[in-house]
């Protein structure tokens, strides 16, 4: 089972674009676009801070932490109104991700 050039294996993703804006002090805003080849019942999401294919129910219910989006050892919390999630590092630093 050979993949054509540019073709992704089923269930995998790749980062297409990554834009960073560090103009604001102590704050970096990153916008990432990924390309995924998800199986039936899956949809593009984030697992361990990388693009991945996740159970579509997670996106529908906005239970973002069920994607396991944070790195090991980080705590995941939903934002108010489930517009995204935060990953809290053991040292207390918080990374916020909003879904658009």
């Amino acid at each position: 089972q050979f993949l054509k050039e540019g073709q992704l294996a089923a269930g995998t993703c790749e980062i297409v674009t990554l834009d960073r804006d560090s103009s604001q002090p102590r704050r970096t805003i990153a916008r990432q676009t990924a390309r995924c080849a998800c199986r039936k019942g899956q949809i593009a999401g984030t697992t361990r801070n990388k693009p991945s294919c996740v159970d579509a129910r997670i996106i529908k219910t906005k239970q973002w932490c069920d994607m396991l989006p944070c790195l090991e050892g980080e705590g995941c919390d939903l934002l108010i109104n489930r517009s995204g999630w935060t990953c809290t590092q053991p040292g207390g630093r918080i990374k916020t991700t909003t879904v658009s």
């Epitope: 089972q1 294996a9 995998t12 069920d66």
Partner: antibody, heavy 120, light 107 residues
Framework: QVQLQESGPGLVKPSETLSLTCTVS????????WSWIRQPPGKGLEWIGY???????NYNPSLKSRVTISVDTSKNQFSLNLKSVTAVDTAVYYC??????????????WGQGTTVTVSS | DIQMTQSPSSLSASVGDRITISCRAS??????LNWYQQTPGKAPRLLIY???TLQSGVPSRFSGGGSGTDFSLTITSLQPEDFATYYC?????????FGQGTKLDIK
């Protein structure tokens, strides 16, 4: 180092409910998926289901009408309830951690297993 | 459901031998395949995930390969502790299904 420990009665009467608990130590239950697997005497492994940090679940359709998996994050525990048991539910029951290695979900930490016999 | 079929069901070999166990999926699962080892009275142990990636702490004499529907687990230079039952498991769909197992014993 994460360790899992199953607990619950070793003998359950037919038609009753089998209840097991898996206690997770050495790590947070909120950072992974968790699973139950069983193995009847002398046979192979059967996947029972998953639970996600939020409490959402995925079950084996062959058991779906009888099984409930729940999580208690405050106690770092997740549980299995299997109702209306019969002799065919006699098995060693394992709990396991499900690790997303990139795109590949695998059960990388297992409890030692607990034997449940269904008999009157 | 995806069916996983292992062959052979049992296998006899000697210390130092090289052996290969096969696993076939009833439909394509890309490389979403895991291998486990189980010794009597013990819980299964993850050996390989993603068809070919060795789990941390697993000796390099174990290797996995394949994609789509056909997979293999190879052990080079068998050691006494390798005599056990081996299971493949797909992680591409619900329900997760295991192969029926391959029992490896000493010739």
């Amino acid at each position: 180092q994460v360790q899992l420990q199953e607990s619950g009665p070793g003998l359950v009467k037919p038609s009753e409910t089998l209840s097991l608990t898996c206690t997770v130590s050495g790590g947070s239950i909120s950072s992974y998926y968790w699973s139950w697997i069983r193995q009847p005497p002398g046979k192979g492994l059967e996947w029972i289901g998953y639970i996600y940090p939020s409490g959402s679940t995925n079950y084996n359709p062959s058991l779906k009408s009888r099984v409930t998996i729940s999580v208690d994050t405050s106690k770092n525990q997740f549980s299995l309830n299997l109702k209306s048991v019969t002799a065919v539910d006699t098995a060693v029951y394992y709990c396991a951690r499900v690790n997303p290695f990139g795109y590949y979900y695998a059960m990388d930490v297992w409890g030692q297993g607990t034997t449940v016999t269904v008999s009157s | 459901d995806i069916q996983m079929t292992q062959s052979p069901s049992s296998l006899s070999a000697s210390v130092g031998d090289r052996i290969t166990i096969s696993c076939r999926a009833s439909q394509s699962i890309s490389t979403s395949l895991n291998w486990y080892q189980q010794t009597p009275g013990k819980a299964p142990r993850l050996l390989i995930y993603g068809a070919s990636t060795l789990q941390s702490g697993v000796p390099s004499r174990f290797s996995g390969g394949g994609s789509g529907t056909d997979f293999s687990l190879t052990i080079t230079s068998l050691q006494p502790e390798d005599f056990a039952t081996y299971y493949c498991q797909e992680s591409a769909s619900i329900p997760r299904t295991f192969g029926q197992g391959t029992k490896l014993d000493i010739k």
